[in-house]
C-alpha cells in the first residue's frame, strides 16, 4: 500500500488514459476578439 | 461499474483544516487517469480545484495552491482533500470526478461543506 | 487562465423547441497536434452532480441522446438540442479541458416556458 502526496508535474498527456489535458507550452495567449 | 463518493464533514468552523475522502469502485487508482476536486459554491459556477493522477503526481489551481495537498491511499482506492484555512467563502458543494484526456467523465454525488463559527 | 463566457446565462423554452447555447473561450482551444478543441459540455440538475453531455466539442458522450449536438472551433462553440425534452430542463455549462487550471463557464440555466 501507499499514501502519498505526490509532486507538481507539468508533462503533457502521454497515454491514452492518462486524464492529462494537453497543456501546450507554446499555447497562444491572445484573447479572443 | 466505475464510482465515485466523497465524504466528509458538513460544517467546518473558519481557520480550520477541511479534510474530504473520495472513494473511487470500479477501477484501481493506479490504472490510470487522474481524479481532480471540483467545487461549487450555492447557486454559482464550478470550479476546479486540482487533480492527482494516477502516477502520484499532482497539480493545483494557483488561486488556492498555498492551502491545498490532493494525496492517495492505494491500498483504500481512496484520495483525500486537505484544505487549510478554511473560510466562509468556502463554503460550496466539493464533488471529485475521474478526468480522462478529453474530460470528466465520472464524477461523485459531493459533498456540501458550510464554514461557519 | 482561459475565461468562458456562456450566453445567456438563462433561457425559456418550452418542449419540443430547437435550443441553442453558446460559449466562447478567451483563447483558441485548438491543439495543433491532434486538430481537436478540447471543449466539453456538461449538464447539471438541482442537487445532482454534473453530467458528461460532449467532449472534444462535438463527440458525443455514451448514452446521450442524438438530440444534443456541439459544434465549433477555436474559440466559438455551440451546443444545440434539437427538440427540448422534459428532462432537458437543467444547467448548462461549457468546460475548457486545454490548459490548467481547467475553467468552467458560467452556466445556462435552461427552465420551461
Known amino acids: 500500500s501507499e499514501t502519498t502526496t505526490g509532486t507538481s508535474s507539468n508533462s503533457s498527456q502521454s497515454t491514452s488514459n492518462s486524464g492529462l489535458a494537453p497543456n501546450p507550452t507554446n499555447a497562444t495567449t491572445k484573447a479572443a476578439g | 461499474q466505475v464510482t465515485l463518493k466523497e465524504s466528509g464533514p458538513a460544517l467546518v468552523k473558519p481557520t480550520q483544516t477541511l479534510t474530504l475522502t473520495c472513494t473511487v469502485t470500479?477501477?484501481?487508482?493506479?490504472?490510470?487517469?487522474?481524479v481532480s476536486w471540483i467545487r461549487q459554491p450555492p447557486g454559482k459556477a464550478l470550479e476546479w480545484i486540482g487533480y492527482i493522477q494516477y502516477t502520484g503526481s499532482t497539480r493545483y489551481n494557483p488561486s488556492l495552491k498555498t492551502r491545498l495537498t490532493i494525496s492517495r491511499d492505494t491500498s483504500k482506492n481512496q484520495f483525500v482533500l486537505t484544505m487549510t484555512n478554511m473560510d466562509p467563502v468556502d463554503t460550496a458543494t466539493y464533488y471529485c470526478?475521474?478526468?480522462?484526456?478529453?474530460?470528466?467523465?465520472?464524477w461523485g454525488q459531493g459533498t456540501t461543506v458550510t464554514v461557519s463559527s | 487562465d482561459i475565461q468562458m463566457t456562456q450566453s445567456p446565462s438563462s433561457l425559456s423554452a418550452s418542449v419540443g423547441d430547437r435550443v441553442t447555447i453558446t460559449c466562447r473561450s478567451s483563447?483558441?482551444?485548438?491543439?495543433?497536434?491532434?486538430?481537436?478543441?478540447?471543449l466539453t459540455w456538461y449538464q447539471q440538475k438541482p442537487g445532482k452532480a454534473p453530467k458528461l453531455l460532449i467532449s472534444w466539442a462535438s463527440t458525443l458522450a455514451s448514452g446521450v441522446p442524438s438530440r444534443f449536438s456541439g459544434s465549433g472551433s477555436g474559440t466559438d462553440f455551440t451546443l444545440t438540442i434539437s427538440s427540448l425534452q422534459p428532462e432537458d430542463f437543467a444547467t448548462y455549462y461549457c468546460?475548457?479541458?486545454?490548459?490548467?487550471?481547467?475553467?468552467f463557464g458560467g452556466g445556462t440555466k435552461l427552465e420551461i416556458k
Open positions: 483563447q483558441s482551444l485548438l491543439y495543433s497536434s491532434d486538430q481537436k478543441n478540447y
Open positions: 470500479g477501477y484501481s487508482i493506479t490504472s490510470g487517469y487522474t
Open positions: 470526478a475521474r478526468g480522462t484526456t478529453a474530460s470528466f467523465d465520472y
Open positions: 468546460q475548457q479541458y486545454f490548459i490548467y487550471p481547467l475553467t
